[in-house]
């Protein structure tokens, strides 16, 4: 009795879904009551399928409502673990253990990454100095630095702060501001750059024609 995996290295984006598969030999019709399936991650029990049903009482709380064994796949000889709304803490080495006559196990590694994709931006103006403050904010993992550039590719000096996200402990909240004298329709870019060549995420900020001055600061 041997379990096989067609893939044992998985990558998923934060907040996405992943289905990891272990295949086992099934002849003719599957006898669910002779099948045992365990899925674990390090010391956390995720799935315990015995006597034709899942025992949710043993499931680690961090996987509650997010992890399930796809029962229809069992009849095809696949123990498929689906995890939804993937978190950074889900990264690690998973183990599928299957008993069906014989017994075997396989390890699968899951890597979770969180690109700085949803970049929020804000442009405000100081009514006294007419200096513009440009702000970009995004969440991701690992840490990123923010590079500010102008449309003529000059690198500008901004100020970046990194805090932990409210959504998840490991996630970083990166905010960067650039103070600059700018004219209408000028274009600036903030680029969230993690160390290495893999991926950058850039937002374009266009200075508007005229920014409304906050009501409390208007002169009448």
């Amino acid at each position: 009795f041997t379990i096989t995996v067609s893939k044992d290295l998985y990558v998923v984006e934060y907040g996405g879904n992943v289905t990891m598969e272990c295949k086992f030999p099934v002849e003719k019709q599957l006898n669910l009551f002779a099948l045992i399936v365990y899925w674990e991650m390090e010391d956390k029990k995720i799935i315990q399928f015995v006597n034709g049903k899942e025992d949710l009482k043993v499931q680690h709380s961090s996987y509650s409502q997010r992890a399930q064994l796809l029962k229809d796949q069992l009849f095809l000889g696949k123990a498929a673990l689906q995890i939804t709304d993937v978190r950074l803490q889900d990264a690690g080495v998973y183990c599928c253990l299957i008993g069906y006559g014989g017994a075997d196990y396989k390890r699968i590694t899951l890597k979770v990454h969180a690109p700085y994709r949803n970049i929020s931006q804000r442009i405000s103006v100081d009514p006294v100095t007419s200096e513009h403050e440009l702000m970009c904010q995004a969440e991701g993992y690992p840490e990123a630095e923010v590079i500010w550039t102008s449309s003529d590719h000059r690198v500008l000096s901004g100020k970046t702060t990194i805090t932990n996200s409210n959504r998840e402990e490991k996630l970083f909240n990166v905010t960067s501001t650039l103070n600059i004298n700018a004219t209408a329709n000028e274009i600036f870019y903030c680029t969230f750059q993690r160390s290495g060549p893999e991926e950058n995420n850039t937002a374009e900020l266009v200075i508007p024609e005229r920014l409304p001055v906050p009501a409390s600061e208007r002169t009448h």
């Epitope: 995996v5 067609s6 893939k7 044992d8 290295l9 990558v11 390090e42 990264a91 690690g92 080495v93 590694t109 890597k111 990454h113 690109p115 993992y141 690992p142 840490e143 993690r194 160390s195 290495g196 060549p197 893999e198 991926e199």
Partner: antibody, heavy 119, light 107 residues
Framework: EVQLVESGGGLVKPGGSLKLSCAAS????????MSWVRQTPDKRLEWVAT????????HYPDNLMGRFTISRDNAKNNLYLQMSHLKSDDTAMYYC????????????WGQGTLVTVSA | DIVLTQSPATLSVNPGDSVSLSCRAS??????LHWYQQKSHESPRLLIK???QSISGIPSRFSGSGSGTDFTLSINSVETEDFGMYFC?????????FGGGTKLEIK
């Protein structure tokens, strides 16, 4: 700028041991899985070992399991490879490698340290 | 282990030529295939990730294609700085494996 600087290579006799080190800088070391990759004299590249960002799990190819041990010290930004019972076919340039955050490939390589196993 | 076979082993071209390098996997690896360049006496560097995704800082003349078992690295109008070794690597299954390499040399 990401920098990976290997050290500890040299000439060792068959059956001997050697510990390689890699000093990392220019990135948040504790956020990335790290690997050792070697290049044999005939220029073939071979994955040697990988360790997760926190150091809680490691991977080795079957032929190196038990002889090689990868470890890391996140406080010092250092990666290590302990090699024992060395054989002549372990002769290679050993590269320290930073794995990508979005997959299992090498984003950055060190300059390498040469290990020669010979009587 | 998944075996990656690169061909040709050596490719002799003139600067300005366009070339294609092949990498074939012993089983399907979806798009989990990456390309590296290694110049003489240097460390490898990442060129293409996930079969076709470009890498910042890499010239646009380098492109990748393929899925499943057959992959291609294309260099549009080779420049003198492009000569060296090219390796493919799979990240579908542990252990990650590399192809034997293709040497791109001046004709």
């Amino acid at each position: 700028e990401v920098q990976l600087v290997e050290s500890g290579g040299g000439l060792v006799k068959p059956g001997g041991s050697l510990k390689l080190s890699c000093a990392a800088s220019g990135f948040t070391f504790s956020s990335y899985a790290m690997s050792w990759v070697r290049q044999t004299p005939d220029k073939r590249l071979e994955w040697v070992a990988t360790i997760s960002d926190g150091g809680s799990y490691t991977h080795y190819p079957d032929n190196l399991m038990g002889r090689f041990t990868i470890s890391r010290d996140n406080a010092k930004n250092n990666l290590y490879l302990q090699m024992s019972h060395l054989k002549s076919d372990d002769t290679a340039m050993y590269y320290c490698a930073r794995e990508s955050y979005d997959g299992y490939y090498v984003a950055n390589w060190g300059q390498g340290t040469l290990v020669t196993v010979s009587a | 282990d998944i075996v990656l076979t690169q061909s040709p082993a050596t490719l002799s071209v003139n600067p300005g030529d366009s070339v294609s390098l092949s990498c074939r996997a012993s089983q399907s690896i979806s798009n989990n295939l990456h390309w590296y360049q290694q110049k003489s006496h240097e460390s490898p560097r990442l060129l293409i990730k996930y079969a076709s995704q470009s890498i910042s800082g890499i010239p646009s003349r380098f492109s990748g294609s393929g899925s499943g078992t057959d992959f291609t690295l294309s260099i549009n109008s080779v420049e003198t700085e492009d000569f060296g070794m090219y390796f493919c690597q799979q990240s579908n299954s542990w252990p990650q494996t590399f192809g034997g390499g293709t040497k791109l040399e001046i004709k």
